[in-house]
Amino acid sequence: SSSLEVLFQGPGLNDIFEAQKIEWHEENLYFQGEPAVYFKEQFLDGDGWTSRWIEKHKSDFGKFVLSSGKFYGDEEKDKGLQTSQDARFYALSASFEPFSNKGQTLVVQFTVKHEQNIDCGGGYVKLFPNSLDQTDMHGDSEYNIMFGPDICGPGTKKVHVIFNYKGKNVLINKDIRCKDDEFTHLYTLIVRPDNTYEVKIDNSQVESGSLEDDWDFLPPKKIKDPDASKPEDWDERAKIDDPTDSKPEDWDKPEHIPDPDAKKPEDWDEEMDGEWEPPVIQNPEYKGEWKPRQIDNPDYKGTWIHPEIDNPEYSPDPSIYAYDNFGVLGLDLWQVKSGTIFDNFLITNDEAYAEEFGNETWGVTKAAEKQMKDKQDEEQRTRRMMRTKMRMRRMRRTRRKMRRKMSPARPRTSCREACLQGWTEA
């Protein structure tokens, strides 16, 4: 069977009050029934993926290949889409039966493995409406949600979570750090109908909260009162000059004075050299600028805080989370160094199912993947050591040869004669 599954398992009306768990969230009534799997792709059928995924028609875009990479936990199960050409844009997408997440949870999940030790490149997915022209998917194509890791230099190692709200891409206000090692990692985004969200990496929560709090979808609830302004007599000075303090009479002394110890050189010629002036020195009695003593300001009122009012432009939106139409999952990326592998894509409405699926895919092969990598690293270390040893041996041999060349020729006599002649070994 195809590894791309599109299933509709909505609740039957007869079962609603028996088998279904009914949850009430603000104005949203929704049913928690059998998991609906809108999209699942594990690349388990060889080249079958090529008929399900569509590439952008542009010759200079990078090619995806099916591969489990240089190391893996299971050579077949860990096969995924791997970027194969450096410094390229990539555009590949798969469509599925369109659905809306209104009144239900949305879970987007996939694995990413940057086995190339990535320097700059995307590892995120975009969810598009089914109106997308897949042959012309590009960076400006309007999407619903963008989610996943992104690395570019030391400054960017983050998980993007971007929602298109009323035609505008809105970025999360939190910084979620992504994994930047060479192993496979599981990324999960959960968006719930109560306008809350959760981001998981490797099936562990790394961020959660409310959509309204963590994105700028809506105008702020409060604004500074435009009719309020600081009263003119509002005194924000904590300290003031002491009006009773006055400068001592002997305070003002020049900063520099002529050096009293300086003497005019004997060979000084006033006609030739002009009038002699002694060099100046720092005046030890100079006290600097006089400043009156500071006292507490009796009129001090503190820092004026601009009062806030309810923002008349704010109104809550209980359906921030909801989209009418999801129909395409796309990889729209740039990679400087290629080698990233994408696998185990899942779009569902069931958090528990997604977690289970993650454990059965990424969870099952992660230990073996690390083992294989460790073994490869060990072998590489051994090879490096062997190479180093060989190099050292060659160097020693070369040095010996050089020494022999440099030392005087040994006389062809017996040892006894040689000793008598006073010849010693070099």
Partner: antibody
Framework: EVQLVQSGAEVKKPGSSVKVSCKAS????????ISWVRQAPGQGLEWMGG????????NYAQKFQGRVTITADESTSTAYMELSSLRSEDTAVYYC????????????????????WGQGTTVTVSS | SYVLTQPPSVSVAPGKTARITCGGN??????VHWYQQKPGQAPVLVIY???KRPSGIPERFSGSNSGNTATLTISGTQAMDEADYYC?????????FGGGTKLTVLG
């Protein structure tokens, strides 16, 4: 934070070309998009084009297409703007400005604004 | 091509709230940035992504954006806020600036 230092003032004859440089320091050059913006005396800001050094490709405002060339040399962390076929209306202060990428896509800088500007280079075109 | 329209000038009394608008077709769907420019100086980014403040920009600067209008609001305006202000957005990989607004602080 990155700092941008531009080359000195230029006086040019109509029909000639000018090449202005913008050297970045104190940041990773490849993590920024560099825009070139000009301002004629008493006028507003006008975007001419930009480049993202890590992607290598430049894009230009339609008005300047064919007359402006923007390049970047990653080895020296320097961006260049060359404007050809100069006319008196090109007399202006030319600024380079950087926007952080904060992502591996060329569109990321759209979100962050031009947060660092060079000091400006005055170009006078006069016969 | 995309056009952003700003009023040429706005006046405000010290301590009062100044509002500078930037009009554009469906500008609410774009990220809008605002720059302050004082005479003889390079522009300075004061608001990005509609309403976020870069570090070092006073709290009195705020922004909003919806429908066909983006707005820069300066509450408790000070004499030092007198400058030219420009809005900017991206359209089809091209940066577009508004014509600029001269803010005059009276008195």
């Amino acid at each position: 934070e990155v700092q941008l230092v531009q080359s000195g003032a230029e006086v040019k004859k109509p029909g000639s070309s000018v090449k202005v440089s913008c050297k970045a320091s104190g940041g990773t050059f490849s993590s920024y998009a560099i825009s070139w913006v000009r301002q004629a005396p008493g006028q507003g800001l006008e975007w001419m084009g930009g480049i993202i050094p890590i992607f290598g490709t430049a894009n230009y405002a339609q008005k300047f297409q064919g007359r402006v060339t923007i390049t970047a040399d990653e080895s020296t962390s320097t961006a260049y703007m060359e404007l050809s076929s100069l006319r008196s209306e090109d007399t202006a202060v030319y600024y380079c400005a950087s926007s952080p990428l904060r992502g591996s896509g060329w569109y990321w800088h759209y979100y962050y604004g031009m947060d660092v500007w060079g000091q400006g280079t005055t170009v006078t075109v006069s016969s | 091509s995309y056009v952003l329209t700003q009023p040429p000038s706005v006046s405000v009394a010290p301590g009062k709230t100044a509002r500078i608008t930037c009009g554009g077709n469906n500008i609410g769907s774009k990220s809008v940035h605002w720059y302050q420019q004082k005479p003889g100086q390079a522009p300075v980014l004061v608001i990005y992504q509609d309403r976020k403040r870069p570090s070092g920009i006073p709290e009195r600067f705020s922004g909003s954006n919806s429908g066909n209008t983006a707005t820069l609001t300066i509450s408790g305006t000070q004499a030092m806020d007198e400058a030219d202000y420009y809005c900017q957005a991206w359209d089809s990989s091209t940066a577009v600036f508004g014509g600029g607004t001269k803010l005059t602080v009276l008195g």
